[in-house]
């Protein structure tokens, strides 16, 4: 059997660190057997069998010129093996970032904080943390560790499915290379890393007969589980074309009627989502949707579907944002959003 322990990595390759002493091991001999060492393709003897170092070659203060292939020969001239030296560095702790687009699953991505120059792999696992004692603020790793399954195709990402929203988790990402291992531990709670995907299906429509009104509607992101316990609230922004500043409102549900649009101008509208109890952060903005208020006279009947602001239709004021709306509202599927008075009655 070979006297050379096989480091993790491709066979026949041995590893060292620049500026450090490196020992190369002749793989095809018995431990301690004297050998001669040569650089591949060069006749010059690097180290003879009388060095007293047996089957090892010592390179003091290795540098990049020492990288390459070495040949070791036994006393009778037989080939003891070939060894390729690759220089690099031990791993540093990777940088880890975790995010959740819903309240049941989260994913973690990582990246090396320093390039080692050596073959590298990552071990990923997690524990669920629990509070010690009823009155104690201390937390300790309790259950696990479980593997955090990595994405196929080598993407630097792993996913924890079926996470508990109120629990804390300790993520372990260990960077491993032939010179060692280094671990980053990251404590995460779903509440703090929750960032929903942006709302979907944003539509902007004119309100016939109302030259300063636009109706925007949207749906929950598809990634958000359909359960009534964890709701989303929304933030809507709109602005006329060529106008730099956004006006912002917090709609009560899945639609909003803008009452201070600029007549005749197309308007950009976008919407963002957040957990309704302010866990985590706001989603990114949805792609913008565009709409232009209708032209024409005001109809005698107010459309039943709109939560219309009751401002009169006066001359357009580009910088008059709509007043903010209540942000904490029940799940859209649980209530009819036709009338805010009706909503209050249901809530009461």
């Amino acid at each position: 059997s070979s006297p050379c322990p096989q480091a993790w990595g491709p066979p026949g390759v041995q590893y060292g660190q620049p500026g450090r002493s490196v020992k190369l091991c002749c793989p095809g001999v018995t431990a301690g057997d004297p050998v001669s060492w040569f650089r591949d393709g060069e006749p010059k003897l690097l180290q003879g069998p009388d060095s007293g170092l047996g089957h090892e070659l010592v390179l003091a203060q290795a540098d990049s010129t020492d990288e390459g292939t070495y040949i070791c020969q036994t006393l009778d001239g037989a080939l003891g093996g070939t060894v390729t030296l690759q220089l690099g560095y031990p791993p540093a702790r990777p940088v880890v970032s975790c995010q959740a687009a819903d309240y049941e699953n989260f994913s973690c991505t990582w990246s090396p904080s320093q390039i080692s120059g050596l073959p590298t792999r990552y071990l990923t696992s997690y524990r669920k943390k629990t509070v010690l004692g009823a009155d104690s603020q201390r937390r300790s790793p309790s259950t696990g560790p479980w593997p955090c399954p990595q994405d196929p195709l080598g993407a630097a990402r792993c996913v924890v499915h079926g996470a508990e929203f109120w629990s804390q988790y300790r993520i372990n990402v260990t960077e491993v290379n032939p010179l060692g291992a280094s671990t980053r531990l990251l404590d995460v709670s779903l509440q703090s890393i929750l960032r929903p995907d942006p709302p979907q299906g944003l539509r902007v429509e004119s309100v016939p007969g109302y030259p300063r009104r636009l109706r925007a509607s949207w749906t929950y992101p598809a990634s958000w589980p359909c359960q009534p316990h964890f709701l989303l609230k929304f933030r809507l922004q709109y602005r006329p074309a060529q106008h730099p500043a956004w006006s912002t409102v917090e709609p009560a549900g899945l639609e909003e009627v803008i009452t201070d649009a600029v007549a005749g101008l197309p308007h950009a509208v976008r919407v963002s989502a957040r957990d309704f109890l302010d866990a985590g952060t706001w989603s990114t903005w949805s792609p913008e949707a565009w709409g232009t208020p209708s032209t024409g006279t005001i109809p005698k009947e107010i459309p039943a579907w709109g939560q219309l602001h009751t401002q009169p239709e006066v001359e357009p004021q580009v910088d008059s944002p709509a007043p903010p709306r209540p942000s904490l509202q029940p799940h859209p599927r649980l209530l009819d959003h036709r009338d805010s008075v009706e909503q209050v009655a249901v809530l009461a």
Partner: antibody, heavy 118, light 107 residues
């Protein structure tokens, strides 16, 4: 010679923008994370932002999140800090630093002064 | 974020004196603690890394110890060129934080 050289500082009005650069030389820039640290006049050191070698992960101090963006161009051996919506409290000397193991700053630039004032 | 506190905030000592600065972290940071020296108008300089390791080229009169939450930085024999502000800094977290600094001058 191993060194970092910052540039791009100056006087800017509140709400304005500035882009800092840090030119690295003497080491393999693309192998290392890079960091911005700032120091307000007469005050202590404050970590601002860091970026990993490949540029795919970044971290920011809460005080600058959403306003500052760190980036790098490994082909130019240059680190950047785009600073938007600047406030008076952003007035500081901004240092570029090379960390080992993400947070051990073994090489620093001389710094560039950013003054936010009307 | 992990908070770092340092004491004293300033001190005066004579040349040759032993000077000790302490640093405390708001939570366990293992040994991920560094010490820096900053002279007026200059960039900081790393002296000690990971609690007790002397950075290459730094004089051996500087030393550090501790782990967990409590750390100590020592100058065994203060020299005139050691007049500076000294900062501790944790990097256990991915958001590094510095202590407020200790200003050292000569009596």
């Amino acid at each position: 010679e191993v060194q970092l050289l910052e540039s791009g500082g100056g006087l800017v009005q509140p709400g304005g923008s500035l882009r800092l650069s840090c030119a690295a030389s003497g080491f393999t820039f693309s192998w290392y994370s890079m960091t911005w640290v700032r120091q307000a006049p007469g005050k202590g050191l404050e970590w601002v932002s860091s970026i990993v070698p490949y540029g795919d992960l970044t971290q920011y101090a809460d005080s600058v999140k959403g306003r500052f963006t760190i980036s790098r161009d490994n082909s130019k051996n240059t680190l950047y800090l785009q600073m938007n919506s600047l406030r008076a409290e952003d007035t500081a000397v901004y240092y570029c630093a090379k960390p080992e193991d993400w947070g051990r700053f073994d090489l620093w630039g001389r710094g560039t002064l950013v003054t936010v004032s009307s | 974020d992990i908070q770092m506190t340092q004491s004293p905030s300033s001190l005066s000592a004579s040349v040759g004196d032993r000077v000790t600065i302490t640093c405390q972290a708001s939570q366990d940071i293992n040994n991920y603690l560094n010490w820096y020296q900053q002279k007026p108008g200059k960039a900081p300089k790393l002296l000690i890394y990971d609690a007790s390791n002397l950075q290459t080229g730094v004089p051996s009169r500087f030393s550090g110890s501790g782990s967990g939450t409590d750390f100590t930085f020592t100058i065994s024999s203060l020299q005139p060129e050691d007049i500076a502000t000294y900062y501790c800094q944790q990097h256990e977290s991915q958001s590094p934080t510095f202590g407020p600094g200790t200003k050292v001058d000569i009596k």
